[in-house]
């Protein structure tokens, strides 16, 4: 049920080299260093699970300070083959090639790799994130234009032997960061091919990968305070639930989310917050260093065990899913947004959850591990939390299955 | 410095319509709603709506529901406010203001006139 | 809808003095009031958020107090710039709903 049991050599202990190689900031994405084409050129790009193209940007855009230059790349060959990525708002199209990709603070190998190369974008790029790029760690199943474009963590590990893993701790900064901030500070770590023990505390407790498209995982229950929402469990994970490095928040379906909205309520009713706060459009400020962390609860989402009838549960404090933000407007308060918000396409696991956690992608054996994050915010009366094991029964039926037609697969 | 940099006074016949901009510089775009205000001469400020830049949602006065729709552009993070079937009722001041704790920053004012 | 009722629409005083303006909600709103500065022809200028709180750059002689219904803009110590319109608005839920204003002459 957790990591106690033996692993293969070259899975597990330091990775020095790797530790601390992530920048960014929950709202606007955790980045890292990677190097395209021959010679190499330096880009910082988003770390996302919840996607699957290595994409970057090739063209000039007002919020890029630099671009990948394919004609400047020895190494670089055409697919000759578009690639249109829309989303609910927004979208990106490129050309598909391949080219020679290394990450400096990474494993010490050189792979080659599909590359989008982005000409168009809309809503994209963000103004001030500092990235350029978007590394997709999740599965072929849903790459674009298809599953038959290899994603670069499979072109990795067929390439190389570098172990099919990777781990992430997301470090939360606690306070506003500003642009000078965020360059200079530490985001966190991306651990390819391994665990690294220095990155967290107490035991993985393992949750399968119910399906390799997203990272989809299964919740079986969802406490606030410890009480229980009492929904049928296929609404948590309606239509699926995903670990999702790339979104902010901890996004909850229409039902979770009011049920969840009212029970975070009722349980800071010492406090009166306006409706916007819970849209996440108005902040809620404090006088600095007086933020009431304690009238908040604390979120428990417990996941499906790796045993029969069996979970753990994974707990989130306040100071995970406040998100602080910097407003010149109240530079006198510690301000926050309420960074949990409603979701059309179920649950995402995002920065606000991953960020309490240290993440283990264990690919190789179908499940994605969780421990509590050696860098995650807390106070000195509450700490997030990893615990099991739980007995649940019928967690099978807690699985959405989203209907296939044949249709289903030209959505978007 | 946060700006909000509205376009121009507008002077429009009854029946038609017109469409509002308001620029923001100073501050990532996507990470603050964007309201606009209604002031006519005598008769206070009048909320209209809002829109979140991120993903486009809006919500409405229910009085101004059938009569401003609000858009945004990401790429230049401008906000828009389209005003249909225009009647001297709607001639007034138009504001764009942006979230926070309540409405910390303005744009500077846009004239609509509605005569024939 | 809630609504925001400032009484009185005129006061008059004079540069030192001191000057309160009141807004009533017509439901508790908590503390979830502003208060905004219009001089002629210009934008509303923001002075009071959460009741009582300050935003950045405003002078102390502006504070504001109150919650639940009753709220009270006061200026102590008033100026001659201090010639304006003001508003109060409830953001504590939507539609988010302004008083009338009270428009403050200098004798």
């Known amino acids: 049920e957790t990591d106690e049991e033996p692993e293969e050599p070259g899975r597990r202990g330091s990775f020095v080299e790797m530790v601390d190689n992530l920048r960014g900031k929950s709202g606007q994405g955790y980045y890292v260093e990677m190097t395209v084409g021959s010679p190499p050129q330096t880009l910082n790009i988003l770390v996302d699970t919840g996607s699957s193209n290595f994409a970057v940007g090739a063209a000039p855009h007002p919020f890029l300070h630099r671009y990948y230059q394919r004609q400047l790349s020895s190494t670089y060959r055409d697919l000759r083959k578009g690639v249109y990525v829309p989303y609910t708002q927004g979208k990106w199209e490129g050309e598909l090639g391949t080219d020679l990709v290394s990450i400096p603070h990474g494993p010490n190998v050189t792979v080659r790799a599909n590359i989008a190369a982005i000409t168009e974008s809309d809503k994209f790029f963000i103004n001030g994130s500092n990235w350029e790029g978007i590394l997709g760690l999740a599965y072929a199943e849903i790459a674009r234009p298809d599953d038959s474009l290899e994603p670069f963590f499979d072109s990795l590990v067929k390439q190389t032997h570098v172990p099919n893993l990777f781990s992430l701790q997301l470090c939360g900064a606690g306070f506003p960061l500003n642009q000078s901030e965020v360059l200079a500070s530490v985001g966190g770590s991306m651990i390819i091919g391994g665990i690294d023990h220095s990155l967290y505390t107490g035991s993985l407790w393992y949750t399968p990968i119910r399906r390799e498209w997203y990272y989809e995982v299964i919740i079986v229950r969802v406490e606030i305070n410890g009480q229980d929402l009492k929904m049928d469990c296929k609404e948590y994970n309606y239509d699926k639930s995903i670990v999702d490095s790339g979104t902010t928040n901890l996004r909850l379906p229409k039902k979770v989310f009011e049920a969840a909205v009212k029970s975070i309520k009722a349980a800071s009713s010492t406090e009166k917050f306006p409706d916007g706060f819970w849209l996440g459009e108005q902040l809620v400020c404090w006088q600095a260093g007086t933020t009431p962390w304690n009238i908040f609860p604390v979120i428990s989402l417990y996941l499906m065990g790796e045993v029969t009838n069996q979970s753990f549960r994974i707990t989130i404090l306040p100071q995970q899913y406040l998100r602080p933000v910097e407003d010149v407007a109240t530079s006198q308060d510690d301000c926050y947004k309420f960074a949990i918000s409603q979701s059309s396409t179920g649950t995402v696991m995002g920065a606000v959850i991953m960020e309490g956690f240290y993440v283990v992608f264990d690919r190789a054996r179908k499940r994605i591990g969780f421990a509590v994050s050696a860098c995650h915010v807390h106070d000195e009366f509450r700490t997030a939390a990893v615990e099991g094991p739980f007995v649940t029964l019928d967690m099978e039926d807690c699985g959405y299955n989203i209907p296939q037609t044949d249709e289903s697969t030209l959505m978007t | 410095e946060v700006q909000l940099q509205q376009s121009g006074a507008e002077l429009v016949r009854p029946g038609t319509s017109v469409k509002l901009s308001c620029k923001a510089s100073?501050?990532?775009?996507?990470s603050y709603w964007i309201h606009w205000v209604k002031q006519r001469p005598g008769q206070g400020l009048e909320w209209?709506?809002?829109?979140?830049?991120?993903?486009?949602?809006?919500k409405y006065n229910q009085k101004f529901k059938d009569k401003a729709t609000l858009t945004v552009d990401t790429s230049s993070s401008t906000t828009y406010m389209h005003l249909s079937s225009l009647t001297s009722e709607d001639s007034a001041v138009y504001y764009c203001?942006?979230?926070?704790?309540?409405?910390?920053?303005w744009g500077q004012r846009t004239l609509v006139t509605v005569s024939a | 809808d809630i609504q925001m009722t400032q009484s009185q629409k005129f006061m008059s005083k004079s540069v030192g003095d001191r000057v309160s303006v009141t807004c009533k909600a017509s439901?508790?709103?908590?503390?979830?009031v502003a208060w905004y500065q219009q001089k002629s022809g210009q934008s509303p200028k923001s002075l009071i958020y959460?009741?009582?709180h300050r935003y950045s750059g405003v002078p102390d002689r502006f504070t504001g107090s109150g919650s639940g219904t009753d709220f009270t803009l006061t200026i102590s110590n008033v100026q001659s710039e201090d010639l304006a319109d003001y508003f109060c608005?409830?953001?504590?839920?939507?539609?988010?709903?302004f008083g009338g204003g009270t428009r403050l002459e200098i004798k």
């Open positions: 203001a942006r979230s926070g704790v309540a409405f910390p920053y």
């Open positions: 100073g501050y990532t775009f996507t």
């Open positions: 209209i709506g809002m829109i979140d830049p991120s993903d486009s949602y809006t």
């Open positions: 439901q508790n709103v908590g503390s979830n």
């Open positions: 959460s009741a009582s």
């Open positions: 608005q409830q953001y504590n839920s939507y539609p988010y709903t």
